[in-house]
């Protein structure tokens, strides 16, 4: 019998399957076809992995499923005829391991900076050659000493960097078989977090309803998650959190309605699979000062001492200063400084003691003038708070007023007795020990106000002049003051210093009378005439205006003419003696007028000004008008303002705040313009409430 196995030899890769057909040629019937394994065992039919199937009288199939290395060897097909004769055929089955990757996971993750070993385990019947590639190139050809292929064919990258990240190919080759296989491994480089606080110290102010945001900037791969602690305790954000808000990535922590309790050490923590890092932020919460205690006090004059106390809270601890409406006690020069917490005024009258949050002001040897409002101000770098307290001083009456009062017969006058007393005093007037008013003195009336008593006297004879007594009494004591009513006289004569003549006017400079007669000078009278004339021309001048510069101007003079001028002063009693005459000669006609003199009066609103025009010499012909130009310095000129000749001022309104302005004015007559008069002024800083105002006007 002829026995053949097809195929005659077999190569199977591990894990693969293959079948072999055993064929018998010849006529013998009832043949038995059997298969034997390499170890000589007869293979039974219907096995699962190595299966023998009898096809028909002349063939049988051996199938090796999912081959493994142990299945290798010579398989025998034996055919036994009915006569017992045996024929056989053999097939040499070779099992080989194909190049495969047993352990080459992807991705493989490493921490930046560590020595990374990329795992790639290869199985193969023959020892393979392993090449590692990155971006298509053999890593060894990179000439980067950090890349080493280890003896086990793993790739080591020393001190792996983020830039080393990417796809690495583990490629195996078996030259004998021309076999090649590769595995692409994704290498991920994880970077531990780095975190930095934008500000290590954050300042905030309490109780202003403000929010403060703490910010940390973190980097790393994978993106770090952020968390926060306050003084070591985790901060969790609840829904509708009234206190904390986190940004989407938790890099920002907003603390709402900052108060003193929020002052703490906050730590922001960044974490990823490569590690964690934290940063610290110190939140310093400052508080505006608040005065927490003041108390009013009452004292008696000449009492030894009284102490006013002021307590305040705040952070930083506030310093406390004291002032009154008229005196800044804390900024005054102090006497010896025994300790910083005790300061004494130079007069020794007040001592300020400060300790932590409390300050006291002690007043020694109390005077009635110490009464009133005392303001303590607590200040720190954040702000300040002030509060008033009141010191009440009880004292016996004190009287004052002009002791000598001048008048004349028939001229009503007030003798003023000013009274300072607490509690308030009752006031009485006496003449020669007799209480006023009385039937003997019908020409006397008394008027009282809270601060003074007025004795109104209309003297009708010599007898009414003389002494009057004012007496005030309260429960602390009493005080009297003697007044004298004196017969007034007319003033002595003013003296002419010099005369400055122009063509049609002259300025007479004078000294006030040595004796006013006891009552104020009301007016001055100037008299002048051309030499050779008999009639004196005269003019009255208001004393207040004339006395300010000590000048009166006489007008309507003829050019190149010699004049005599003299002055007298008028008071309530009458016109005083006239001065000696002083001669001067007017100048020839000049033509143009002299520039006016300018004086400014700032408006109460702070951004308007009244510029007074004081007319000087008209140059011999009447002034037609004044021309005014003005501007904020370094800004544009405003349109020219033309004022009628009678104007004595111009109002400039709606000016810029806190700006320097210049004003020029010329007087113009028929002959031409004067030189320009110039005036510079500054407006006030802008107030919070702005008064309404208009545009320039003249008067």
């Amino acid at each position: 019998l002829q026995v053949d196995i097809v195929p005659s030899q077999g190569e199977i890769s591990v894990g693969e399957s293959k079948f072999f057909l055993c064929q018998v040629a010849g006529d013998a019937k009832d043949k038995d076809i059997s298969w034997f394994s390499p170890n000589g065992e007869k293979l039974t039919p219907n096995q699962q992995r190595i299966s023998v199937v009898w096809n028909d009288d002349s063939s049988s199939t051996l199938t090796i499923y999912n081959a493994n290395i142990d299945d290798a060897g010579i398989y025998k097909c034996v055919v036994t005829g009915e006569d017992g004769s045996e024929s056989e055929a053999t097939v040499n089955v070779k099992i080989f391991q194909k190049l495969m990757f047993k352990n080459a996971p992807t991705p493989q993750e490493f921490r930046e900076g560590e020595d990374a070993v990329i795992v790639c385990d290869v199985v193969s019947s023959l020892p393979p050659t392993i090449i590692w590639k990155h971006k298509g190139r053999d890593v060894i050809l990179k000439k980067d000493v950090r890349f080493i292929v280890l003896s086990n064919n793993y790739l080591q990258i020393r001190g792996i960097k983020k830039t080393d990240e990417g796809t690495y190919r583990c490629e195996g080759r078996i030259l004998a078989r021309g076999e090649i296989n590769f595995k692409d491994i994704q290498v991920i480089v994880n970077v531990p977090p780095t975190i930095q606080a934008r500000q290590n110290i954050v300042n905030a102010t309490a109780n202003l309803g403000q929010s403060v945001t703490l910010v940390c900037d973190a980097e790393g791969f994978p993106e770090p998650t952020m968390s926060w602690t306050k003084d070591g305790e985790q901060i969790e954000q609840e829904e509708d959190d009234e206190k904390y808000i986190f940004s989407d990535d938790s890099s920002q922590l907003t603390i709402k309605k900052v108060d003193k309790n929020d002052e703490a050490e906050y730590i922001c923590i960044a974490e990823n699979k490569a590690g964690e890092q934290d940063a610290t932020i110190h939140l310093k919460v400052f508080a505006k000062p608040k005065i927490t205690y003041v108390e009013n006090q009452t004292a008696m004059e000449l009492e030894e001492q009284v102490t006013l106390t002021c307590e305040a809270s705040g952070d930083p601890i506030p310093s406390i200063t004291w002032r009154t409406s008229t005196r800044n006690i804390s900024s005054e020069e102090k006497a010896s400084w025994t300790r910083p917490e005790k300061q004494e005024t130079l007069d020794g009258h007040m001592v300020v003691r400060s300790h932590a949050r409390v300050s006291s002001l002690t007043l020694k040897s109390i005077q009635y003038t110490d009464a009133g409002e005392y303001i303590c101000t607590a200040s720190n770098t954040i702000g300040q708070d002030s509060q008033s307290m009141y010191l009440e001083v009880q004292y016996a009456p004190k009287l004052q007023g002009p002791v000598a009062v001048y008048t004349w017969e028939g001229n009503q006058v007030n003798i003023t007795c000013e009274v300072f007393a607490y509690p308030s005093a009752t006031i009485s007037w006496f003449r020669d020990g007799q209480l006023l008013p009385s039937s003997n003195y019908s020409n006397i009336k008394i008027y009282n106000t809270p601060s003074a008593s007025y004795l109104e006297v209309t003297p009708d004879s010599e007898n009414d002049f003389g002494n009057y007594n004012c007496t005030a009494v309260n429960r602390i004591g009493q005080e009297s003051l003697e007044f004298i009513l004196v017969q007034a006289d007319t003033p002595s004569s003013p003296s002419i210093d010099q005369v400055e003549p122009y063509s049609s006017t002259a300025q007479v400079q004078f000294d006030e009378p040595e004796a006013t007669g006891g009552v104020p000078i009301l007016k001055y009278k100037a008299e002048w005439r051309a030499v050779g004339e008999e009639v004196w021309h005269s003019k009255w001048y208001d004393a207040k205006e004339a006395s300010m510069e000590g000048i009166v101007t006489i007008v309507g003079l003829k050019p190149e003419t010699t004049y005599a001028v003299r002055l007298a002063a008028l008071n309530g009693k009458g016109l005083g003696e006239i001065s000696a005459a002083s001669e001067f000669k007017t100048q020839p006609v000049q033509g143009e007028p002299s520039a006016p003199k300018l004086e400014g009066q700032m408006g109460e609103d702070g951004n308007s000004i009244k510029v007074n025009l004081i007319k000087q010499d008209d140059g011999g012909s009447p002034i037609r008008h004044y021309l005014v130009r003005y501007r904020a310095l370094s800004s544009e000129w405003k349109p020219e303002i033309r004022l009628p000749s009678g104007s004595d001022h111009v109002m400039l309104k709606s000016l810029d705040w806190n700006a320097e302005y210049e004003v020029y004015v010329v007087a113009e007559n028929q002959q031409g313009k004067s030189k320009a008069a110039h005036f510079v002024f500054r407006t006030s800083a802008q107030p919070t409430a702005i008064p309404a105002n208009g545009s320039p006007t003249s008067g």
Epitope: R629, W637, K638, P639, E640, A676, V680
Partner: antibody, heavy 124, light 107 residues
Framework: QVQLQQSGPGLVKPSQTLSLTCAIS??????????WNWIRQSPSRGLEWLGR?????????DYAVSVKSRITINPDTSKNQFSLQLNSVTPEDTAVYYC??????????????WGQGTMVTVSS | EIVMTQSPGTLSLSPGERATLSCRAS???????LAWYQQKPGLAPRLLIY???LRATDIPDRFSGSGSGTAFTLTISRLEPEDFAVYYC????????FGQGTKVEIK
């Protein structure tokens, strides 16, 4: 009568500083009713005001926006003159430079007195 | 800044004729602050008119100025040979600016 006499170099290199002086006779640089100006004239820009200095209880300067960052005008009371300095010049600054008085005292206000002019060329 | 525009650029006239030069401002100029200057080749400009209509010292009365708001005019009633020159208008209410000039030439 009032006269203005200019002096200074006619050639300046690019990026350097142009410096001119204007001496006043017959008036005072410290007058509170005058202002002392520099003006230039070139074919491309015509007459162009550059700036002024004036005294109004203190010294003030006004400058044209086009040169504000480069110009300085200084008075010299001891010599009764004023000067122009123009920094970082370019050929664009080539022009005839004039000094002139703004007369407020006489209510003229415009430029009533001019210097003789200085031709300044900016070239390397 | 206020831009001053003069027209015409050139005016060709004969001696004895009347010359009318125009100057327009890009925004309103107070008449107190407008001037006219005359410039001859190689010389500095010379002030002719200030405050729109007032003649400067020694300026003959054939020169007159008028206008208000944004439109101003310089008139030379009878041109003399010495009047042929370039004329500039200028505003000096804010930062001073000049017109580009009108050349008056002999026809």
């Amino acid at each position: 009568q009032v006269q203005l006499q200019q002096s200074g170099p006619g050639l300046v290199k690019p990026s350097q500083t142009l410096s001119l002086t204007c001496a006043i006779s017959g008036d005072s640089v410290s007058s509170n009713s005058a202002a002392w100006n520099w003006i230039r004239q070139s074919p491309s820009r015509g007459l162009e005001w550059l700036g002024r200095t004036y005294y109004r209880s203190k010294w003030y300067n006004d400058y044209a926006v086009s040169v504000k960052s480069r110009i300085t005008i200084n008075p010299d009371t001891s010599k009764n003159q004023f000067s122009l300095q123009l920094n970082s010049v370019t050929p664009e600054d080539t022009a005839v430079y004039y000094c002139a008085r703004e007369n407020i005292a006489a209510w003229t206000w415009a430029f009533d007195i001019w210097g003789q002019g200085t031709m300044v060329t900016v070239s390397s | 800044e206020i831009v001053m525009t003069q027209s015409p650029g050139t005016l060709s006239l004969s001696p004895g004729e009347r010359a009318t030069l125009s100057c327009r401002a890009s925004q309103s100029v107070s008449s107190s602050y407008l001037a006219w200057y005359q410039q001859k080749p190689g010389l500095a400009p010379r002030l002719l008119i200030y405050d729109t209509s007032l003649r400067a010292t020694d300026i003959p009365d054939r020169f007159s100025g008028s206008g208000s708001g944004t439109a101003f005019t310089l008139t030379i009633s009878r041109l003399e040979p010495e009047d042929f020159a370039v004329y500039y208008c200028q505003q000096y209410g804010s930062s001073p600016t000049f017109g580009q000039g009108t050349k008056v030439e002999i026809k």
